[in-house]
Each structure stands twice: as C-alpha cells, then as structure tokens.
C-alpha cells in the first residue's frame, strides 16, 4: 500500500518545510486516494474484462452512486462554494457503504482497499472543518445501507465484478470533480 500523505521519505528528509495549509492537505489526501483507486482498478482490470465491457448499463441500474450535477454548484458555471462542499461531503458519506462492499473484493490489494476506505474517512474530517453548514448534510441511513450491502453481496459473480468496476470508476470521477472544485475554493 502507498504511504499515507505526510509520511513519505521526502517529509523526513525536509523537516523544515512549511506545514501544509488546509487546502493543500485536502488536495494531497484526494490524490493519495486516487492513487489507491488506480491500484485497485489495475487488479480489477487484470482479473476480468470488465474494463472493456459495454454491458455496464445492466449493473448501473442497481447502483445509486453519487454523481456531480449542475445544481450541486461544483462546476465552473454556477459555482457555489458552500453548496458544492455540502455535495462533496454528502457524496463521500454515501460512497462509504460502497467502499465497505469493496473490502472483500480484492485478493492481492486487500490492504489497499482498506487504505482507500480509511483515507476517505480522513478526507471527510478535513472537509468538515472547512464547511460552514453541517446541518445541510444528510448522513446515510444505516438501515438503508444494510439492505443495499446485502443486495450487492447477493449478486452473481459477473455482477459483483461489474459492481466493483463501476464503484471504482464512479468514485474516481467523483474525486476528480471534487478536486477540480476544491481548487477553486
């Protein structure tokens, strides 16, 4: 598993560097998670042909993965910092159950899957410090999450592989959009 942000050898070699600003820390954290997703996608793509599959729509119907929309205020047109921040945090909290699903889906990258899950928690905490209106954030209902997880785990092997691929792809896209938006804040 890659080394978490702030713990790489360069940090040890340069102890007199300025501490990271909150924005820099968030940026670094997202890039770290994206690196982890790349490693997981590599294993998924090596294991099955999902990455070239055109049958994604079949599995996508089952999933309600968070996506950025115009109304979320994260795109350049109609950008709204607070609305966007609420969307990013809400989306990450919604992704948590899907990251839980990923935990038993990897053989050689088991640690990496756990690192992505834990690093996402850290990212949520960083972002919460930045948000002004936590009351606008709706957390996922655990009962709904439990039935979703049960449903995903009961799928046949092909659908589970497709679900894994779709979660990783959607999470990557969501984080990339978040990164672009956060760089405007």
């Amino acid at each position: 598993a890659p080394v978490p942000p702030g713990e790489d050898s360069k940090d040890v070699a340069a102890p007199h560097r300025q501490p990271l600003t909150s924005s820099e820390r968030i940026d670094k954290q997202i890039r770290y998670i994206l690196d982890g997703i790349s490693a997981l996608r590599k294993e998924t793509c090596n294991k099955s042909n999902m990455c070239e599959s055109s049958k994604e729509a079949l599995a996508e119907n089952n999933l309600n993965l968070p996506k950025m929309a115009e109304k979320d205020g994260c795109f350049q047109s109609g950008f709204n910092e607070e609305t966007c921040l609420v969307k990013i945090i809400t989306g990450l909290l919604e992704f948590e159950v899907y990251l839980e699903y990923l935990q038993n889906r990897f053989e050689s990258s088991e640690e990496q899957a756990r690192a992505v899950q834990m690093s996402t928690k850290v990212l949520i905490q960083f972002l919460q410090k930045k948000a002004k209106n936590l009351d606008a954030i709706t957390t996922p209902d655990p009962t709904t999450n439990a039935s979703l997880l049960t449903k995903l785990q009961a799928q046949n092997q092909w659908l589970q592989d497709m679900t894994t691929h779709l979660i990783l792809r959607s999470f990557k896209e969501f984080l990339q959009s978040s990164l672009r938006a956060l760089r405007q804040m």
């Epitope: 909290l93 948590e96 439990a146 979703l148």
Partner: nanobody, 118 residues
C-alpha cells in the same frame, strides 16, 4: 456486541426538558452511527435522530430545533437533550448503534420511558 443502556427518562410537564443518556459497554466503542428512536403508546417505533462517526447529526422533522444529540467519546456515551417537550413526545425512547456503514442498527438498548403531561 455492544451493550447499550439508556437512562434519564421520567415524567415532565409540557414545555420542560429532559436529557437522556445512552451508555455503551462491550467491545471498542466507535460505531459508524448512533441513533435515537421512540415508540409512542400504541404506535410503531419511529426515528428521532442520529449522529454519525464524524459528528454530523440528522433529526426527524417533528423534533428539529427542540432535540439535540451529542456524544462523549471518552465516556462512550451519547445524549439526547429534549427541550420544549410536548405531550406527543410521550414514548419509550431507545438508542441504537450501527457498528459499520453496512451493518444497519445491530445493537439496541432496552429503552427508557418519557411521559410528558399537559
């Protein structure tokens, strides 16, 4: 499995306040979400509010602005502060814990009775 024990219930007049506590014991207490529910007499159990692992709180519309959930991680306790109580808040109040993001509420307390008289 986490054991949850509620306390702080009782009889209070309309407009008054009560603070319920939910103390957890058992394995390491760092649940994904802690929730409060209530069951009014002759009705089904309903959601009151929840606090997730990162401290974000959500409430049922019927209690918004009157009830506040907080937690003390050092004492493994979650609280429900109830202000401006109404007779329709009369119920048995339960706390519940969801240990992981996909586990649902997998631990429940026995409940504590709250009666609001008019």
């Amino acid at each position: 499995q986490v054991q949850l024990v509620e306390s702080g219930g009782g009889l209070v007049q309309a407009g008054g306040s009560l603070r319920l506590s939910c103390a957890a014991s058992g394995r390491t207490f760092s649940p994904y979400t802690m929730g409060w529910f209530r069951q009014p007499p002759g009705k089904v159990r309903e959601f009151v509010g929840r606090i997730n692992w990162s401290g974000i709180r959500n409430y049922a519309d019927s209690v918004k602005g009157r009830f506040t959930i907080s937690r003390d991680n050092n004492n493994n306790t979650v609280y429900l502060q109830m202000n401006r109580l109404k007779p329709e808040d009369t119920a048995v109040y339960y706390c519940a814990a969801a240990s992981q993001s996909g586990s649902g509420y997998d631990s429940w307390g026995q409940g504590t009775q709250v009666t609001v008289s008019s």
